[in-house]
């Protein structure tokens, strides 16, 4: 808390500019009008204030807007955003994607902080669903964003948004999340032809049921082992040796190296030995 002191003669700020950078904390408190600060927030970011000085500026805005900042101020917070607590952010109503982008830019290159997580939560809840533009933006800043959502939250993702998802965005998703995303992806890409469809759907196949894997095995897709190893065990078990051979194509030889790992291990144990022998890989059921 900065003590209330009178502004020294001649130091009253007429605008937010560099003249303030060598003001002491108490001078900033006494000499900068909060309403002036709010209308000239866009200037703050260009001026190299210290963290301590930013604390004072935040305190002034908090006094001016006890119920939460208006979006016109939020959009121009810049580095002052790093000073906000999740409690501060919960008071905000952020509706503009441009505002979201501006604040994510400030945190760029860093882990997702509690502040950013709260901001995103407020934004998405305000929109009612995770639309394509929002998802595009969030995954650009945080490739793991999608996989940080619960299955319930993912259920609000419209299929049209799936076009924004890149393979790396799904790297940390668990099967429960892929179970939700896969049907959406299937719907989103349904009008694509075979080979193009497989390229797009491949990252989502960890949520695919057996019947879809059987269908893919009829399309000469040549699934790589890395993708196969991420498939649901319960979806792989009913597949026949012939279906797995067609599904993997030339990659079928890779089964030998993975024979001790799920789902390959469990699948091998379900097969008849003479069927496995047709692969010529020495797999033992």
């Amino acid at each position: 808390e900065v003590e209330k002191t009178a502004c020294p003669s001649g130091k009253k700020a007429r605008e937010i500019d560099e003249s303030l950078i060598f003001y002491k904390k108490w001078e900033l408190e006494a000499c900068v009008d909060a309403a002036l600060l709010a209308t000239q927030m866009d200037r703050v970011n260009a001026i190299p204030f210290t963290y301590e000085q930013l604390d004072v500026l935040k305190h002034k805005l908090d006094e001016l807007y006890p119920q939460g900042y208006p979006e016109s101020v939020i959009q121009h917070l810049g580095y002052l955003f790093l000073k906000m607590s999740p409690e501060d952010i919960r008071k905000w109503n952020v509706t503009s994607l441009e505002t979201l982008k501006a604040l994510l830019e400030v945190n760029k290159g860093h882990e997702m902080s509690p502040q950013v997580a709260t901001l995103i939560d407020r934004f998405v809840k305000g929109r009612g669903q995770l639309d394509k533009d929002t998802l595009d933006t969030l995954t650009a800043f945080y490739p793991g964003y999608l996989c940080s959502l619960s299955p319930e939250e993912l259920s609000s993702v419209p299929p049209s948004s799936i076009w924004a998802v890149r393979p790396q965005d799904l790297d940390t998703c668990d099967p429960r999340q892929l179970d939700v995303l896969y049907p959406k992806a299937r719907l989103a890409f349904q009008n694509m032809n075979g080979s193009e469809y497989f390229v797009k759907i491949q990252s989502f196949l960890g949520g695919a049921p057996t019947e879809d894997l059987k269908a893919l095995s009829q399309q000469n897709v040549s699934m790589d082992l890395a993708t196969f190893m991420k498939l649901r065990t319960d979806a792989v078990l009913p597949l026949t040796v012939a279906e797995v051979q067609k599904l993997l194509g030339p990659h079928v030889e890779g089964l030998k190296a993975e024979e001790r790992h799920r789902p390959v291990r469990d699948w091998i144990l379900r097969q008849r030995q003479d069927d496995l022998d047709t692969l010529g890989l020495g797999l033992q059921g």
């Epitope: 060598f22 260009a46 190299p48 963290y51 930013l54 790093l82 760029k108």
Partner: nanobody, 126 residues
């Protein structure tokens, strides 16, 4: 650590010119802001002119606009203040001040530190 040494002050008649220099040594490759700050007798410190590296802009106090010019010679690590048409109210101790960051990155972190010179006195008197 950063050391700043000012020179060029002195007694000058109104309407004449002076050029102040500030030689910087130490770790100033990560400067964000370099400026000239003056303190008149019995008054507070006032930023007169500054160079903002982050915004790539120059600042001048209203009272010196059109008369003072700040510049920097990177090769000599020296900051200058060219003062023309000096007035009695320009009489003050002039300090060179630098604000640096622990690391300069394009995203402009705020862990900043101030360094000051010892000051050079400028007296404008007839």
């Amino acid at each position: 650590q950063v050391q700043l040494v000012e020179s060029g002050g002195g007694v000058v008649q109104p309407g004449r010119s002076l050029r102040l220099s500030c030689a910087a040594s130490g770790n100033i490759f990560n400067w964000f802001y370099m400026g000239w700050v003056r303190q008149a007798p019995g008054k507070g410190r006032e930023l007169v002119a500054g160079i903002n590296r982050g915004a790539n802009t120059y600042y001048y106090a209203d009272s010196v606009k059109g008369r003072f010019t700040i510049s920097r010679d990177n090769s000599k690590n020296t900051l200058y203040l060219q003062m023309n048409s000096l007035r009695a109210e320009d009489t003050a101790v002039y300090y060179c001040a630098v604000r640096t960051g622990d690391s300069y990155t394009s995203d402009y972190r705020r862990d900043l530190h101030d360094y000051w010179g010892q000051g050079t006195l400028v007296t404008v008197s007839s």
